[in-house]
Interface confidence: low
Amino acid sequence: THLGIRLPLRSGLAGPPLGLRLPRETDEESEEPGRRGSFVEMVDNLRGKSGQGYYVEMTVGSPPQTLNILVDTGSSNFAVGAAPHPFLHRYYQRQLSSTYRDLRKGVYVPYTQGKWEGELGTDLVSIPHGPNVTVRANIAAITESDKFFINGSNWEGILGLAYAEIARPDDSLEPFFDSLVKQTHIPNIFSLQLCGAGFPLNQTEALASVGGSMIIGGIDHSLYTGRLWYTPIRREWYYEVIIVRVEINGQDLKMDCKEYNYDKSIVDSGTTNLRLPKKVFEAAVKSIKAASSTEKFPDGFWLGEQLVCWQAGTTPWNIFPVISLYLMGEVTNQSFRITILPQQYLRPVEDVATSQDDCYKFAVSQSSTGTVMGAVIMEGFYVVFDRARKRIGFAVSACHVHDEFRTAAVEGPFVTADMEDCGYNIPQTDESTLMTGRA
């Protein structure tokens, strides 16, 4: 990912779930024992502040040291602050842990802007509002960083939930989730419900409010409405998927579908925006502009640099179109579409100068590293990372912010031929170059 707009450096994710709870509908899928049902202890275990990501509480070491850890499906290292830093209220103190083991190996992770570096080790790790297990996991103890930690963000580390292929320093460093599944009977699946606020929160509200749920080992019925639709994981590195069609308010962008996945399309909870390849971004903005032409917005707004504000409570949501992404389905020549609202892609921000207004940033932006389905997408949906069956599921989130006319939607099936051709094949020679740009 282009790390200038990836968390934790970057423009942020919307906060806690103040959207509407939708009624449950009948799920058409068959039950799978041990994979679905109620995970009460894990519901509402995430918190987040607009612009600063979603984090879960974890404990590390013996006796346990409690830290808040950013949930990131776009990287694969478990890395925590392990030295004093002006932005950290607490950090992992290895010397106080009787179970810490030093791997005598360093790790250096450069970003487009900033970096972190540290020392590798292992220790006992658990998630208090997660499964009742303790595992020994690899930990990167961050000793130095630049533009990584965020002042006031309330998290002290990052939990990379993607695959070993993109782990640093190399793919021999087993990611946390792999360790968890290997050492326990927990099924190889997790699911995320990120709940955007829909409007800015002051600091007290943001800290006190719930931000969503990370369900480890299964699927919780109460977190979504309708049915789950699955798209294959194309390759196990990032959570890579294939987009086969894009529509703005039902109007097809009519581009070669390879453009949508150039050079990849990933689902990334550590990125704020819906990020689109240059050509796709330009076409999408042109279409969104046309659909919302009843009001004129400065170019800076469409570039994500400028806010637009309306008097509190009067945001004209309905002049903005819906955005639909069609994803490859599990059945040959079958796709399904996920549709997000302006309530997802206009990100609420606090504008101190005009605190009586509701102000927003346009949270669709340009990418040079493919499509990134960040929080803007994920906040509309309950997203199931079914690693065991190499697929990602989407259903309408029970906490997504919407209005009285439209809700986010997951609909299908649609007939789409030659979907395999939509995937971009990265030339081998380029791959190592691409990998140096992110965590």
Epitope: L20, W317, F405
Partner: antibody
Amino acid sequence: QVQLVQSGAEVKKPGSSVKVSCKASGGTFSSYAISWVRQAPGQGLEWMGNIIPIFGTATYAQKFQGRVTITADESTSTAYMELSSLRSEDTAVYYCARSGGTKYGMLDVWGQGTMVTVSS
Amino acid sequence: EIVMTQSPATLSVSPGERATLSCRASQSVGSNLAWYQQKPGQAPRLLIYGASTRATGIPARFSGSGSGTEFTLTISSLQSEDFAVYYCQQLYTWPPRTFGGGTKVEIK
């Protein structure tokens, strides 16, 4: 300032249909929802459904599902509400109202109302 | 659907006095509530939205409060033109956007 002007009073026979129009003037029509609300004599307000002309799809209250059709014509800035299989209890004043499409969806501009009498 | 209950059905108040109208939701609607005023033979008029924000042109004597399931509309000093029926409406779930049964404010 947006104004909503509704069609005139109607007298209908049971089992027939009625179509009430609501013309918007003085402001944007397409991107704001038009809701229909009815009020039987001496009774309270009852929300029937709404439509956003730019999207064309209507949402209906369960009670009226299958009997009501809400449409809009962007070219004339007019919304329509058609109620079929009329019965005496459908005698009411039918209002159209605009919702600003905001976070709250309140009905901020109302038509003057159309009296529909269903009588044999 | 969410049921909105208004009380009292009728409120008798003298001009210049304070009137307090209540609206209760069968489940939490957050601050997603509006109040409307309706005079005989007229269409309703929006008074309050977002539970407490006055609509454009509404006098300051009208104020709304509450969140969740309990809401109040207060008219601090009743004027002759305020005698009317008042409705609350939940703006939280749909369809339908349910209204309360109304409170008639009459001259004592």
